[in-house]
C-alpha cells in the first residue's frame, strides 16, 4: 500500500549546472494524499538553511505528483549554492535532500584573465 506521508523527491547529492542570465526553475516534487502541504525553499549557509521569503514560487500540478517551483529569472552568479525544500504536514516538518546549483557566469567565462593577470592573482589558481 502507498504511504500517505508527504514525500519530497529531490535526489541526494543532485546537482544542476546552469548559466547566469538564463531563466531556471528548480523543482521540488511533492507527493501527498489529501491536503497539499505548505512548502518552502531555503538556501544552505553552512549548516543553517535560510528561508527564501521574497522569491517567486509557483505550483505545477500533475496526475500523481505536484511540483513546488523556485523561479530564477534570471539566474545570478550568487544563486550558486545548495537548496532544500521543506513541507509542513500535520505539524511535522519534512525536509528534502539538498540540491546544488553550479552557476557559470557567462561574462567571466568569456572574459578570461590574461596570463599576467593570473600571475598577479594567485588566489584564482586554487
Amino acid at each position: 500500500k502507498e504511504s500517505c506521508d508527504v514525500q519530497l523527491y529531490i535526489k541526494r547529492q543532485s546537482e544542476h549546472s546552469i548559466l547566469a542570465g538564463d531563466p531556471f526553475e528548480l523543482e521540488c516534487p511533492v507527493k501527498y494524499c489529501a491536503n497539499r502541504p505548505h512548502v518552502t525553499w531555503c538556501k544552505l549557509n553552512g549548516t543553517t538553511c535560510v528561508k527564501l521569503e521574497d522569491r517567486q514560487t509557483s505550483w505545477k500540478e500533475e496526475k500523481n505528483i505536484s511540483f513546488f517551483i523556485l523561479h530564477f529569472e534570471p539566474v545570478l552568479p550568487n544563486d550558486n549554492g545548495s537548496y532544500r525544500c521543506s513541507a509542513n504536514f500535520q505539524s511535522n516538518l519534512i525536509e528534502s535532500h539538498s540540491t546544488t546549483l553550479y552557476v557559470t557566469d557567462v561574462k567571466s567565462a568569456s572574459e578570461r584573465p590574461s596570463k599576467d593577470e593570473m600571475a598577479s592573482r594567485p588566489w584564482l589558481l586554487y
Epitope: 514525500q7 523527491y9 535526489k11 546537482e15 539538498s98
Partner: antibody, heavy 119, light 112 residues
C-alpha cells in the same frame, strides 16, 4: 520485474575503447543513480563513477576521469559506460548498479560484463 | 579519498555460528542530513554483488532477518546471527556519503 541486463563479453586490443550497455526495466531510470563498478580477476570492487539519468550529471573517480564516459538514454532506459585507451589492467568484470536516489529504497545490480584487454 | 578497512579479510565459520564483520572508514560517513550512507553487499563466486543493508542498518527487502547492521561515524558492523549454508560468500562494505565512493577490500566467509 526489476532487471538490469548488460551487454555481452568483449575482447579488446590495448589502446582501443569499449562501450558497455545496461538495459534497465521494472522501475523509472530517472528516479535512480546509475553506478559503474569494476572487479579485476580475483580482486575487490572498484567504483568508476555515477550518472544521474534525470539531468545527465556525472561524477567519476579521479582514476577514471577523462578516460571513462558514463551516459544514460532515458528514452530506452539504458545506461552506458565507455572506457577508452584500454590497457591490460582494465581486464575486469564491469557492473552497472541502479540505486534509488531519494530514499535509497532499492539497489539493483546488473549481471556484469567481462572485458578482456589483450594484444 | 576515504579508505574503508574491513576486518577480518577472511573468516572460517560453521553453520549456526554467529559472525561479525567490521568496517572502519578513514573519516566520518555522517552526511549533512545526519545519516551515514554505508551499505553492505554480498557476492557469491561468479555472481554480481547484491545489496543486503543500506543506511547502516536497514535491510533490503527479501534479506533474512539473521543479517543486521550497526554502527555510526567511522565504525560499522555486519552481523549474521546464525550462519546458513547459503551465507558463505564475500562481503563488502561500501560508502556513498563522500565522493569518490569507496569499497572495503572484502571479507571472505568460508566453511570451517
Amino acid at each position: 520485474q526489476v532487471q538490469l541486463v548488460q551487454s555481452g563479453a568483449e575482447v579488446k586490443k590495448p589502446g582501443s575503447s569499449v562501450k558497455v550497455s545496461c538495459k534497465t526495466s521494472g522501475f523509472n531510470i530517472k528516479d535512480t543513480y546509475i553506478h559503474w563498478v569494476r572487479q579485476a580477476p580475483g580482486q575487490g570492487l572498484e567504483w568508476i563513477g555515477r550518472n544521474d539519468p534525470a539531468n545527465g550529471n556525472t561524477k567519476y573517480a579521479q582514476k577514471f576521469q577523462g578516460r571513462a564516459t558514463i551516459t544514460a538514454d532515458e528514452s530506452t532506459s539504458t545506461a552506458y559506460m565507455e572506457l577508452s585507451s584500454l590497457r591490460s589492467e582494465d581486464t575486469a568484470v564491469y557492473y552497472c548498479a541502479s540505486y534509488e536516489g531519494y530514499y535509497e529504497r532499492f539497489g539493483y545490480w546488473g549481471q556484469g560484463t567481462l572485458v578482456t584487454v589483450s594484444s | 579519498d576515504i579508505q574503508m578497512t574491513q576486518s577480518p579479510s577472511s573468516l572460517s565459520a560453521s553453520v549456526g555460528d554467529r559472525v561479525t564483520i567490521t568496517c572502519r572508514s578513514s573519516q566520518s560517513l555522517l552526511d549533512r542530513d545526519g545519516k551515514s550512507y554505508l551499505n553492505w553487499l554480498q557476492q557469491k563466486p561468479g555472481k554480481a554483488p547484491k545489496r543486503l543493508i543500506y543506511l547502516v542498518s536497514k535491510l533490503d527487502s527479501g534479506v533474512p532477518s539473521r543479517f543486521s547492521g550497526s554502527g555510526s561515524g567511522t565504525d560499522f558492523t555486519l552481523t549474521i546471527s546464525s550462519l546458513q549454508p547459503e551465507d558463505f560468500a564475500t562481503y563488502y562494505c561500501w560508502q556513498d556519503t563522500h565522493f569518490p565512493y569507496t569499497f572495503g577490500q572484502g571479507t571472505k566467509l568460508e566453511i570451517k
